[in-house]
Every structure is written in C-alpha cells, then in structure tokens.
Amino acid sequence: SPTPFGPEGQLADELHKPKAIQTEVKPSVRFNLRTSKDPEHEGCYLSLGHSQPLEDCGFNMTAKTFFIIHGWTMSGIFENWLHKLVSALHTREKDANVVVVDWLPLAHQLYTDAVNNTRVVGHSIARMLDWLQEKDDFSLGNVHLIGYSLGAHVAGYAGNFVKGTVGRITGLDPAGPMFEGADIHKRLSPDDADFVDVLHTYTRSFGLSIGIQMPVGHIDIYPNGGDFQPGCGLNDVLGSMAYGTITEVVKCEHERAVHLFVDSLVNQDKPSFAFQCTDSNRFKKGICLSCRKNRCNSIGYNAKKMRNKRNSKMYLKTRAGMPFRVYHYQMKIHVFSYKNMGEIEPTFYVTLYGTNADSQTLPLEIVERIEQNATNTFLVYTEEDLGDLLKIQLTWEGASQSWYNLWKELRSYLSQPHNPGRELNIRRIRVKSGETQRKLTFCAEDPENTSISPGRELWFRKCRDGWRMKNETSPTVELP
C-alpha cells in the first residue's frame, strides 16, 4: 500500500474519485500528552473538562506546550517521523508539555474528505486550548502548534478559532492540493498566530505540488528552492530507503520539512540560516546573502520572530542529511575578456582553501549567461566549515551550446591548427560568507598572469578584507 501523499498520481486520482463508502468511524480527536521520550510509552490522554489527567500526567501549566499535528494518512498509523519529533522536543525543552493530536480516524480517509475534516479538528484543538486557558498560569503565548502537511492547515484553523492568539505556529510543508490560492481563512495564514513560520520542501510549479507553493506565514523558508531535496533523488532512494520507488521520493521530499525542524532542535550548535530573496533563481545567482534589515534568519525552532513581516520568502541550501547545515558563499567574478571564445559557454569550478578545511571542487551554477567585461555573481556552498578562507583555485571548461556550434568550432580548428587557445581573463574574485557576513577579496597570485585556458588552473590569494567599492561601507552584522 502506498505511503501518505504519494506518489503524485495517486493523490491526483484521489482528488477526482467519487466518494467511496467509508467505514463508520467516530469523529474523534485525541490529545496524547507524551510523558516520556520512549516512543513505546502510551503517554496520557487529556480529556476536555477533566482536570485529573492534567494532574496525574504532570502537565506543567507554566511551561511551553507543543501540539504536534499529523497530516493525511493512507495507512492509518502514526509514521516514524512522529516519535523522532517528540523525542527532539523533549531533548530540547525538558520541562515542556508535548501533546500529539491524534486525528487518525478523520485523516485515514479519501484526501478530499480528510481536507474537509481539517476544520473540525482545528476546532477541537481550539476548544482544548480555550479550556486550558481557564486554568491558572496557562498562557496561550506559550503554545506552539507544529503541523505537518494537512496538519499545518489544521493548526491554522486552531489558531483562527481559539479565543486569543497562539504564540507560534510552525507549518512543515503545508499541504498544497485544495489549499493553493485559497482564502486566508481556509488555510494556514499569518493571522493564525503571533508568529507563523513555514518550511516548504515539496513544491512543484509543474504537475501536482504536494506542498503549498505560495507563502502562508510571516516567514516562508524554501530549502533548496523548496523543490528537489538532496538525498531524495530516485538514485538515493533506491539505495538507502525502504521501498525505493517514486512514492519514496515524494515522501522523502515532503517529510524533509520535519527533519529540518528536528535538526534545528537537536543540532542547536549547527544552525542553518536562510536568506530573504524574491525568488529561487535570484538566490541561486548568489545575490541574496544579506543579513541587513532582518534579511536572514535561523530556520526551524531557532527562527527569530520577525515583526511586521508578511510573506517573507527565504532560501537556503542544505546537506542530504543531519546535520543539514551548509556554508553559503557569494562569489563575484569579473570576467575582463574572452579570447577566441566563439560560441562557447564557460563553466567555472572553484576549490576553496581555509584555515579549518578545504572544499571539494565546486561547480558554479550558471543561472544566466556569463557576461564578458562584467561582474558575474554565483552561489557556492560547502558542507564543512572551512574557517577563514585563504585561497581559491579556479578552473573552467567550455560547453558548446549546440552540435552546430561544436561543428563550427571543430572546422575552425582544423582549418587553422595554430589558432591560439581560448582564454578568459580574471583578476580577482570577491567572496562574501552568508554565515559570517564577512567580505573578502582574492587577487590573482601572479598579477601578470590572469588569463586562463580550459582545464588550466588560476590561483587567487586573499588580498584584503572587505570589497573596495565606491560609496560603500561594510556594516558590522550580527547574525540572529
């Protein structure tokens, strides 16, 4: 039987299926206070209007209270991410109350029916919160609703219906189908809590988008552009995960939001930073690594509340597994001239050398054509902390744009065998670290030799801190 939300085709079928005769189920929502990190422990079930379980189970009225809200399910069981998240919350916030909202009977339905049940589940959570508010010392400001997939919209309804304002809602890849473009009262939105932060990990602009593409919080974070997650490709999945099908790719990418959040809880010393940007392409070009004016933030649990922000889209790259943190660098390369380039498009590769470690050879992703006699901006990222950068090795290769151009090049070479080689002229590379916000300039090791042919290498050494640019002073930046 297929995993929840996958593969895409099955969900598409679900959306167009006539309503089947369902097994009669109790329209019930249960609240399980997880009193132990042991996932096998049965915990304590809270009951609206009954104070005794609160006392018996040691509910801490003054502590933070997390409500974990699952999504649609095709198997009817709690999936394994749940106990991982419960354990991580207990590890990070030892005194906190961790409550699992069990709406499995209402989620174990046709997708369309589960969607229609989100409102009633949200209402049940709101009623539970309203009742808890009647208790001394319980504060709605200490409540953090964490909803995965369809559960994110349930959290939105709960925040909307409760008397007062919930402290925080985290949406972990909120469900897309039937919510994309919906009215703010029919989906998760910034109005639903004092702070709404969202991680988008499975969005697609083509085909069915399992996760919602539109921003729905105060901050909306799109790791790896919010679409293709490292370690979730079919090749990765075939080798390392159960089942090894397109179903697992969908599950891997959709569920990545949960694991990024878990990572932020357990790897507090390795926080991942996201950077505000208007779109994914601009981020890929490396032009959005600024922390000025709240333009960067930690992701997941460590995210800082950003006031007066609506729908701030933020981006970052990640590793394929925990810890997910990478180190982002903006690289500005001024290509002074082409020599005998023809129709060839260069691909750059850099190796970064630092005080702590050296990077692998990293390709510079070309989002737009490389301009000559212009400064080209790139984004590179490393999985390890290199420390302070000391030097950079640059190489390039030519990739022909078409077979016709390749033939033209070959014919040109055969007719003029002594044709001088193709060369690029690069004198300096400017680098900005996203994580430290430090700016450095690297100059060609030999100022007299700044031309580089394909396959050859050019070395650049740090020549000064900062970027000497007209009318620009580099502000001191403190990361959040």
Partner: antibody, heavy 120, light 112 residues
Framework: QIQLVQSGPELKKPGETVKISCKAS????????MNWVKQAPGKDLKWMGW????????TYADDFKGRFAFSLETSASTAYLQINNLKNEDTATYFC?????????????WGQGTTLTVSS | DIVLTQSPASLAVSLGQRATISCKAS??????????MNWYQQKPGQPPQLLIY???NLGSGIPARFSGSGSGTDFTLNIHPVEEEDAATYYC??????????FGGGTKLEIK
Amino acid sequence: QIQLVQSGPELKKPGETVKISCKASGYTFTNYGMNWVKQAPGKDLKWMGWINTYSGVPTYADDFKGRFAFSLETSASTAYLQINNLKNEDTATYFCARFSYYGRHYFDYWGQGTTLTVSS
Amino acid sequence: DIVLTQSPASLAVSLGQRATISCKASQSVDYDGDSYMNWYQQKPGQPPQLLIYAASNLGSGIPARFSGSGSGTDFTLNIHPVEEEDAATYYCHQSTDDPPWTFGGGTKLEIK
C-alpha cells in the same frame, strides 16, 4: 500484568463462519493497536492486518481482504477476528498481538493463539 | 511488499557456542538513522516472543546473550553463549512506516 487471552480451539466445516476473540488486560485497551497474525501448520507467520482499537477502523493485508473482518467490543477490552465462508486453507493458528501507536510498530505482547481446523 | 529472507533455514549449535542467524530484506528498512527490524523467538505450541526491536534493542526481560545488529537490508541475530532453552524457531519482522508488515521464513535452532 499485561495479558492477551484468546478463545479456545475451533473445528469448523468449509463454508461456515468462525469468530475468534482476544481479551486484553493490564493496560488501557484503546491506547494500543491490535494485529492479527496467521500461522498455518509448519509454516511461517503472516501478518493479516490490524485494527485501531479507539476508532474501530480496520486495515487488512491484501491476502485477507474479503472474507476476514476485525471488530471490537471496547467495553470488554476485546478484539475479534471473524472469518466467513471458511476454506480448508484457513486451517491455522491465529494470534492477536498489540503494538504501540506512537512507537516503532513492533509486537510486544501476543495472545496464546487460537487453533482453527477446517475440515469436511 | 518487502520480502525478508532468513538463513540458514535450520542450524545446530553446541551448548555454550554462538548461533548466528541472518535476515536479508528485499529493500532497505532504514529510516532516518533507525532500522525497523525486529526479532522474535517461538517455541512449539507457544506464541512468538519479542527478543529484539529496532535492529539492536533488547526486549523487556530478554537475557543479554541475545543481540541484534545490522542496517539497511542486512541484519543478524546472535545468541552467545547458547543455552538449552534457546532451542526454538526465530523470525525477523520489518515494521517500516507503511504496511504490510512482513516476517521472514524462520530459522530453526537445535542445540547439540
């Protein structure tokens, strides 16, 4: 202590119906899922499916869809397995086994088994 | 469905020696650093009893001579030193996120 006690052995003819019970004690019945597992004589274990003891929603493995039905009597902390239109190949020992909703889905407590013999 | 293949089908081990039983899954049963593989012991006329859960964790009341290891698709149950009472059939069982949950074909252990 935690116990799952199943009903006694059954001898049935092909075409008949049997209902096997599994009574739980020592824990809150609705807080754990209940599985059913089949073991034919001299054969390995085969998972038949499970029932959510709170909602009453059953889930069946593909080979056990149709003639098989899981049900509950929550007030008596009892789960039932009913097999309709019995066939000779239903001859086996049937086990109930519980698992934690919140955990890693292993089966920590088992009933003693109910032997069903189907013979004309 | 995930198919679990156990080997050997039967083995005879001398008292005090080590018994090693292997279980190979048709696909990985790993998830985020954990392996969802369990082991059960079944004696004639009795129900199975949980020995090991999540590949290497000892079930409640199970003696330390039982141990489990492995990840991905390859798992092993070790019994050392083997005792008389360990004569039984041993089953592996995968409990990944998505049913159907499946069992291996069993390994019958005899004590010499």
